[in-house]
Interface confidence: medium
């Protein structure tokens, strides 16, 4: 009779993570008598996967009943496959021996490859806010996929970005891989409502890529523009001066009025109006009693936005142009100076 051969008909098997792998193996003869064992890998470091004779292998089931006398099918199923299960599996026939069974013949091996989906991409932006015209970096990470081939794209709103660097790690062979990409994005004043999107395409996703997003509202700071104007006189000897704070984001803002450099009032932006682009406007007013001043008054609207150094705008109120009997505001002028105060004023909130 011809000598027993161990046949593993599949050179390779491809299985998705979480599924069951079937590893086929048949013997061509019932002789010699003895058990079969399955191993992952060859040589002294091989890993026992299944032993027909003894042991507990909860993830492994046999395809046919190995207790039947004439059985020559030694195929197994391995459940709940993970990328760590990848490798070459050998079906090995042992000859009954004393005291130990002796390895008789091995199959040619079946390479198990595992397809694993990438995790949902996680996009993270810079730790600190940045102002328009600045370039900021966003990172995107996805893990646990196999095989290694993967495509990553970046978008700002609907537009694909080109300035990015991508690494797939490890660079060598591995059971699963990670991708890490860093994109550079230039901020504009209109980016409060913008989104940065990282899109990952992989063979396991069947054409339905995974996306991770970051809102630029968490990254951008749009500094305010200030305008100080004098309103028509409300009452005799009183002048109403307003400070328009426009197009700022985020909302965190504190305004201080100064009369000739002395703090008059401090308030925090509360009832703001929102612009279409997501930025905010706010207005504060100051009622100045002209009769209380002998000389001209320098009014300053000083704004501290989102913890940044204060910006200010001043307005000169000419007291000489306000005789008590007149309600004219013609001589009042807006200097238009836009000073930066790099010291912080500590005020009691009004």
């Amino acid at each position: 009779e011809e000598e027993l051969q161990v046949i593993q008909p599949d050179k390779s098997v491809l299985v998705a993570a979480g599924e069951t792998a079937t590893l086929r193996c048949t013997a061509t003869s019932l002789i010699p008598v003895g058990p079969i064992q399955w191993f992952r890998g060859a040589g002294p470091g091989r890993e026992l996967i299944y032993n027909q004779k003894e042991g507990h292998f909860p993830r492994v089931t046999t395809v046919s009943d190995l207790t039947k006398r004439n059985n020559m099918d030694f195929s197994i199923r391995i459940g709940n496959i993970t990328p760590a299960d990848a490798g070459t599996y050998y079906c090995v026939k042992f000859r009954k021996g004393s005291p130990d069974d002796v390895e008789f013949k091995s199959g040619a091996g079946t390479e198990l490859s595992v397809r694993a989906k990438p995790s949902a991409p996680v996009v993270s932006g810079p730790a600190a806010r940045a102002t328009p015209q600045h370039t900021v970096s966003f990172t995107c990470e996805s893990h646990g996929f196999s095989p290694r081939d993967i495509t990553l794209k970046w978008f700002k709103n609907g537009n694909e970005l080109s300035d990015f660097q991508t690494n797939v790690d490890p660079v060598g062979e591995s059971v699963s891989y990670s991708i890490h990409s860093t994109a550079k994005v230039v901020l504009t004043r209109e980016d409060v409502h913008s989104q940065v999107i990282c899109e990952v395409a992989h063979v396991t996703l069947q054409g339905d890529p995974l996306r991770g997003t970051a809102n630029l509202s968490e990254t951008i700071r749009v500094p305010p523009t200030l305008e100080v104007t004098q309103q028509p006189v409300r009452a005799e000897n009183q002048v109403n001066v307003t400070c328009q704070v426009r197009k700022f984001y985020p909302q965190r803002l504190q305004l201080t009025w100064l009369e000739n450099g002395n703090v008059s009032r401090t308030e925090t932006a509360s009832t703001v109006t929102e612009n279409k682009d997501g930025t905010y406007n706010w207005m504060s007013w100051l009622l100045v009693n002209v009769s209380a001043h002998r000389d001209d008054v320098k009014l300053t609207c000083q704004v501290e936005h989102d913890g940044q150094p204060a910006v200010s705008k001043s307005h000169d109120l000419k007291v000489s142009a306000h005789p008590k009997e007149q309600g004219s505001n013609t001589a009042a002028e807006n200097t238009g100076s836009n000073e930066r105060h790099h010291h912080h004023h500590h005020h009691h909130h009004h």
Epitope: N167, D169, P170, V171, G172, E173, H180
Partner: antibody, heavy 119, light 107 residues
Framework: QVQLVQSGAEVKKPGASVKVSCKAS????????MHWVRQVPGQGLEWMGW????????KYSQKFQGRVTITRDTSATTAYMELSSLRSEDTAVYYC????????????WGKGTTVTVSS | DIQVTQSPSSLSASVGDRVTITCRAS??????LNWYQQKPGKAPKLLIH???SLQNGVPSRFSGSGSGTDFSLTINSLQPEDFATYYC?????????FGGGTKVEIK
């Protein structure tokens, strides 16, 4: 036996380019990657990039991106590294080294090519 | 990019001493770490790959260990020919990077 034979020393002026060759023998050229590593006098080792000799896939260090070009000629079993816009700080010994595809270690090294950049 | 920090930068030892050099990666690199020896005017020579696998032809007095972020190279009984500079290199992620080197000098 496995060996990598590099081209001879070069002296270049700032702004010029240099092309260093690395002839491989004693193994199947297309079965490995070829790395390029440089060493500035008195300093450590700095990886510049690799080429996978089989499929031609190239990876450069960001530091040299735009200035370095790595190529290979499989019929001549030779890898090349060209560095352009040379400056004095590029004066160094440039090594080619055979790379494993799994752990990306460099198991065989050329003797090195000294490139001197001086006006 | 992954940074690899080697320590010490230099050490003095005598023949027969046991010497240990450490290498720390800025993030986990599994066992993708290799060790090289370089003598003045010569190309580096691979000693250990995959953190602990001794390269063919390298004396058994050299050994490597570690995984994740912390690794070490040990020379069990220092020989005269072992006085050289040693470099670790991570091969987990590009750009591949080397440690700054450890110069082993005669005491």
């Amino acid at each position: 036996q496995v060996q990598l034979v590099q081209s001879g020393a070069e002296v270049k002026k700032p702004g010029a380019s240099v092309k260093v060759s690395c002839k491989a023998s004693g193994y199947t050229f297309t079965s490995n990657a070829m790395h390029w590593v440089r060493q500035v006098p008195g300093q450590g080792l700095e990886w510049m990039g690799w080429i996978k000799a089989g499929n031609g896939e190239i990876k450069y260090s960001q530091k040299f991106q735009g200035r370095v070009t790595i190529t290979r000629d499989t019929s001549a079993t030779t890898a090349y590294m060209e560095l352009s816009s040379l400056r004095s700080e590029d004066t160094a010994v440039y090594y080619c080294a055979r790379g494993d595809y799994y752990y990306y270690y460099m198991d065989v090294w050329g003797k090195g090519t000294t490139v001197t950049v001086s006006s | 990019d992954i940074q690899v920090t080697q320590s010490p930068s230099s050490l003095s030892a005598s023949v027969g001493d046991r010497v240990t050099i450490t290498c720390r990666a800025s993030q986990s690199i599994s066992d993708f770490l290799n060790w090289y020896q370089q003598k003045p005017g010569k190309a580096p020579k691979l000693l250990i790959h995959a953190a602990s696998s001794l390269q063919n032809g390298v004396p058994s007095r050299f050994s490597g260990s570690g995984s994740g972020t912390d690794f070490s190279l040990t020379i069990n009984s220092l020989q005269p020919e072992d006085f050289a500079t040693y470099y670790c290199q991570q091969s987990y992620s590009t750009p591949l990077s080397f440690g700054g080197g450890t110069k082993v000098e005669i005491k």
